[in-house]
């Protein structure tokens, strides 16, 4: 969580970011909160990167005001207008690109004052692990697949009923470059799989973190995924 | 309730040009994108380029650069497409379309009814 | 640009068929693919955008998915009103563009 604040006292009003990541060629939220105002046509927001020349985005006396906008952000980028009046000057971005990433500034300009304040945004590509039995193995094993990650993730394999023990002896991983040629499809296979026992496939960067789980019992197979990005720190 | 209403068919003569208009109403104007597709008979659609009222900004389909100009009037909420060098294969409706998310460019969510442009000789 | 190529470009089917209807892109992966329905003298409608956000009021049986260059409509149990004309459209990038069009005609 970045929170800055103006430059004179009471001329300044509380800006909050929050640091994230982008799934690229996916929609991707820029987080920023500010002091509402009770005037819609009071409030400015300006969107600036680090080392592009124009804006990212500018909202002014209630609307989009995209002249300054720099060309690399046309048509790529919106506020919820509707909820600037209490507060939000959120950004939404359209096809999220590995050169969207950077430092970025929301800075905002109220009846109240004027407030910034920084936001790091990377890029990058997460997805969802799905864990299942490869019945075409000669002996029980286990396949886990995440269509899309960037940068090369780590793959680590856990048990409940071995915790601790190192899997890396007995799976085998491989990453397959998707027809884009940035993103890769992450496949990872556990061999020597017991049942009555839950496994976990853990897939990690720099931006996220998923975990496919897979309980296998006599009776019946469960699944479980999820995924946590790393970097949602405030400011 | 957003409504997208296009001048009538016309009828034009091959080397002549076509301003098709599509006035606007329920909605923010200069908010939205607003884009050209066009159709010939019996055939798929077409998309011809996209323009930003609030501030002029345009995109053009590479096959009708040069030759087709997207304009917009902020005081009347009127967009035009101007279609010059006419030939028998520019026959089709032309149809403009608001786009959704506002400055963001997202899908075509609304559409005119459609204006019949004919090339004959 | 990235071109459209969309699959079959017609298909016969009859009330509580299920339909699919997919299209592939050239290059890239973005999740910007719309579905749109269109009858004979009509303007488009939408019907999906962003592979697979059904529009307000669009009945549930239409659902579309994808990832990577391969998207699909899928029409769960189709209806007496569906039989129309299905055009895919990619609008993540600059240039927009469609597909050729599916024709769902009734057996």
């Known amino acids: 969580l970045i929170i800055g604040f103006g430059i004179s006292g009471r001329h300044s009003i509380t800006v909050t970011t929050v640091a994230s990541a982008g799934n690229i060629g996916e929609d991707g939220i820029l987080s920023c909160t500010f002091e509402p105002d009770i005037k819609l046509s009071d409030i400015v927001i300006q969107w600036l990167k680090e080392g592009v020349l124009g804006l990212v985005h500018e909202f002014k006396e209630g609307k989009d005001e995209l002249s300054e906008q720099d060309e690399m952000f046309r048509g790529r980028t919106a506020v919820f207008a509707d909820q600037v009046i209490v507060g939000n000057a959120s950004l939404r971005l359209k096809n999220v690109q590995l050169t969207d990433a950077g430092t970025y500034k929301c800075y905002i300009i109220t009846s109240k004052g004027k407030g910034n304040a920084n936001l790091e945004y990377k890029t990058g590509a997460f997805s969802m692990p799905e864990v299942n039995v490869d019945y075409n193995a000669s002996s029980e094993t286990l396949r886990c697949e995440a269509p899309r990650w960037f940068p090369q993730p780590t793959v680590v394999w856990a048990s409940q009923v071995d915790q601790g023990a190192n899997f890396s002896e007995v799976s085998n991983t491989s990453f397959e470059l998707n027809s884009e040629n940035v993103t890769m499809k992450v496949v990872s296979v556990l061999y020597n799989v017991t049942i009555n026992n839950t496994y976990s496939c853990m897939i990690e960067n720099d931006i996220a973190k998923a975990t496919g789980d897979i309980k296998v019992t006599e009776s019946e197979i469960k699944r479980r995924s999820h995924l946590q990005l790393l970097n949602s720190k405030a400011s | 309730e957003v409504q997208l209403v296009q001048s009538g068919a016309e009828v034009k003569k091959p080397g002549a040009s076509v301003k098709v208009s599509c006035k606007a109403s329920?909605?923010?104007?200069?908010?939205?994108?607003i884009g050209w597709v066009r159709q010939a008979p019996g055939q798929g659609l077409e998309w011809i380029g996209d323009?930003?009222?609030?501030?002029?900004?345009?995109n053009y389909n590479e096959k009708f650069k040069g030759r087709a100009t997207l304009t917009a009037d902020t005081s009347t909420s009127t967009a035009y497409l101007e279609l010059s060098s006419l030939r028998s294969e520019d026959t089709a409706v032309y149809y403009c379309?608001?786009?959704?998310?506002?400055?963001?460019?997202?899908?075509?969510?609304?559409w005119g009814q459609g204006t019949l442009v004919t090339v004959s000789s | 640009d990235i071109q459209m190529t969309q699959s079959p470009s017609s298909l016969s089917a009859s009330v509580g068929d299920r339909v699919t209807i997919t299209c592939k892109a050239s290059?890239?992966?973005?999740?910007?693919v719309a579905w749109y329905q269109q009858k004979p003298g009509k303007a488009p409608k939408l019907l999906i955008h962003?592979?697979?956000t059904l529009q307000p009021g669009v009945p549930s049986r239409f659902s579309g998915s994808g990832s990577g260059r391969d998207y699909t409509l899928t029409i769960s149990s189709l209806q007496p009103e569906d039989f129309a004309t299905y055009y895919c459209?990619?609008?993540?990038?600059?240039?927009?563009?469609f597909g050729q069009g599916t024709k769902v005609e009734i057996k």
């Open positions: 323009i930003y009222p609030g501030g002029g900004y345009t």
């Open positions: 962003y592979t697979s």
């Open positions: 459209l990619q609008y993540g990038n600059l240039l927009y563009a």
């Open positions: 329920g909605y923010t104007f200069t908010s939205y994108w």
């Open positions: 290059q890239g992966f973005n999740k910007y």
């Open positions: 379309a608001r786009l959704d998310g506002s400055s963001y460019r997202g899908a075509m969510d609304s």
